[in-house]
Interface confidence: low
């Protein structure tokens, strides 16, 4: 940072991540004269917008402006006034809005229209709000973590986590878990990407990358839970659902109309003889795991190998950064340490899920019950997704690094998105024509 007495020769950028469960605003900063250096951009602020994701405002779009106010005002405070007009603002909406668009394009457009009008009222350089594709979400997450880890530079990074005797330029794979979708993105080893939908070609800093990516819509942790409930209520003999993914003693009433509100449960929809049912927790990890596995169709694969639901997945290669809800959930469960083996994680999950709900509430008194109640499911789901969905093993588990931030910046798609839209990732090394948006998405 420059000395306060002199004007800072820096630039700022704002990205809003409009996720399925909430919206977060990120402010990035970089030295103006070093725009094309690899790795000069860093996060200076994160502001979590109070309330749900923007897709929930479909019946109350007039409230969107108020909803965004606090964080946009925070941005106004953090960024010097002299910089406001030249600070770009981007909003990217992810799977929550993809689902809304599947239900009604008109409703999704209306929400985005009101969001755009609200954001245009601020003194920044608003660049638009759009629903990003799952492929973009995976790609930008991959770019973010590898940019922050210094993988795109020819220089050795002293803080690289790979000991320096090994090839420091090997990129990390990216594992992103949201509320409504999950993404897996990595560079396979000498493997043809058999499905064109899953192939990305980038040229970054003079090097070519052939990247595999897939976004599994409806397999974020919240939508996966809705799927599991919809599947399990089909075979319930009455309006009581004894659920192994919730703690013993936990009870919650669910409206059937809420259950079938999302497109993710359509495949399990049936006419039920009741409008509500009650979840009663029995807290059994093994049974919960079995129930979750039924969401993954592994019986059909038109490729040499698949993840699930007939989606191509090459053999896993290298280290992976697991972020967003992968990190938040595992951090809560105290399972992010490199030293914790997959067997130990499973053991801990068994113990955690078996703990009585009253005991859990006392132990975690400061945590909202809605979130607290779902950690058993979420932790079990993460294990099921990584092991059975993506085919990690007890051995390759040690290649998964649960990451919240890298050098002070959040791991996630937003930084990669801004880097691309502001043309700050040159195709050539050292400096050359920046990538156009269409180069790889």
């Amino acid at each position: 940072t420059q000395n306060k007495a002199l004007p800072e020769n820096v630039k700022y950028g704002i990205v809003l991540d409009a996720g399925s469960s909430h919206t977060s605003l990120y402010i990035y900063k970089w030295p103006a004269e070093k725009e094309n250096d690899t790795g000069v951009v860093h996060q200076v602020e994160e502001c979590r917008v109070k309330g749900p994701g923007i897709s929930k405002f479909v019946q109350k779009v007039n409230e969107i402006g108020i909803y965004l106010t606090d964080c946009m005002e925070r941005a106004r405070e953090v960024i010097p006034r002299s910089q406001h007009q030249e600070t770009p603002v981007y909003l990217g909406a992810t799977a929550g809005m993809r689902l809304l668009r599947m239900e009604s394009e008109e409703l999704a457009d209306r929400v985005l229209d009101v969001v755009e009008r609200s954001l245009s009222n601020y003194p920044f350089d608003f660049q638009g709000a759009r629903i990003i594709t799952g492929q973009e979400e995976g790609a930008y997450g991959w770019i973010t973590i590898n940019y922050l880890l210094g993988k795109f530079s020819q220089k050795t990074r002293w803080f690289s986590i790979v000991p320096y005797e090994t090839n420091n330029q090997e990129t990390f794979g990216a594992l992103d878990l949201g509320g409504a979708s999950t993404q897996v993105t990595f560079v396979p080893q000498n493997q043809t990407i058999e499905s064109p939908d899953n192939a990305l070609q980038f040229r970054l800093y003079g090097k070519d990358y052939n990247v595999y990516t897939h976004s599994f819509l409806c397999y974020g942790k919240d939508q996966a839970l809705w799927q599991k409930l919809a599947k399990d209520i089909q075979v319930a003999s009455n309006e009581i659902l004894r659920d192994p993914c919730f703690h013993p003693g936990y009870k919650k009433v669910v409206n059937v109309s809420d259950l079938y509100k999302t497109p993710c449960t359509k495949r399990f929809e049936m006419t039920l003889p009741f409008q509500q049912f009650e979840i009663q927790g029995i807290g059994n990890y093994q049974q919960c795991h079995q129930s979750i596995l039924e969401l993954f169709n592994t019986s059909y694969c038109p490729y040499s190998q698949c993840a699930f639901n007939g989606i191509f997945l090459p053999p896993l290669q290298g280290d992976f950064g697991a972020f967003s809800a992968f990190y938040f959930v595992m951090k809560f469960l105290n399972l992010t340490s490199e030293k914790v083996s997959q067997e130990k994680v499973t053991e801990m999950m068994k113990k955690f899920c078996a703990q009585p709900w009253e005991e859990i509430k006392t132990s975690y008194a400061g945590v909202k019950e809605k979130y607290l109640s779902e950690y058993c499911f979420s932790g079990t789901y993460i294990l099921s997704l990584l092991l059975q969905g993506y085919h990690f093993t007890a051995d390759s588990w040690e290649h998964i690094h649960f990451i919240g931030k890298i050098q002070g910046s959040d791991a996630g798609w937003t930084l990669g998105y801004m880097l691309n839209l502001t043309n700050m990732i040159p195709a050539e090394q050292p400096l050359s024509t920046p990538l156009s948006h269409s180069t790889y998405v």
């Epitope: 000069v40 922050l148 790979v162």
Partner: antibody
Framework: QVQLVQSGAEVKKPGSSVKVSCKAS????????IGWVRQAPGQGLEWMGG????????NYAQKFQGRVTITADESTSTAYMELSSLRSEDTAVYYC??????????????WGRGTLVTVSS | EIVMTQSPATLSVSPGERATLSCRAS??????LAWYQQKPGQAPRLLIY???TRATGIPARFSGSGSGTEFTLTISSLQSEDFAVYYC?????????FGGGTKVEIK
Amino acid sequence: QVQLVQSGAEVKKPGSSVKVSCKASGGAFSSYAIGWVRQAPGQGLEWMGGIIPTFGTANYAQKFQGRVTITADESTSTAYMELSSLRSEDTAVYYCARDGGGYQHHYFDLWGRGTLVTVSS
Amino acid sequence: EIVMTQSPATLSVSPGERATLSCRASQSVGSNLAWYQQKPGQAPRLLIYGASTRATGIPARFSGSGSGTEFTLTISSLQSEDFAVYYCQQLTKWPLTFGGGTKVEIK
């Protein structure tokens, strides 16, 4: 305001080991790299190695490879540097420092006060 | 490893005068160079990073320049509190290496 608080001075016998701690108080710890630098009496600064607590994997200067172990405990926001097979020339002040850099440009923007380790028979 | 050489080893300057400290790298380090100030009994303090960017709270009389292998730290008008040892450090390649230091003393 983030501070790096180091453990107290140590007197050690040749051949033994010393473990110095560095606790971050008042701010983010896990996501920043922590480096260890030593300074022998009247001498300059010498980098020993570093770690990003989030990942737990350390890098060491070749000179100290096999003798130094750098670890971090995220739950207590503490980094550790253990130096084994001590000899008299290891007598120095050992500093921990945070790399506050923006990935392209690294720099140690925050330092502990140092821990004096004296190796004497 | 990259060897950092600082010169002169000692610089005698009167208060109010200009001080120019030099740092040379045995191979290119780009602009990934930092300067630190250290006073007796204290930890080093960051002055400059990225070869030319002043750290937070560092007075404007301190400036850095250079890239590749030749770097300079300039103190435009020495104040009494500036008499100290100054180190340069490259942060491009392992091991991260420091120069031997330049002691700025009162003439």
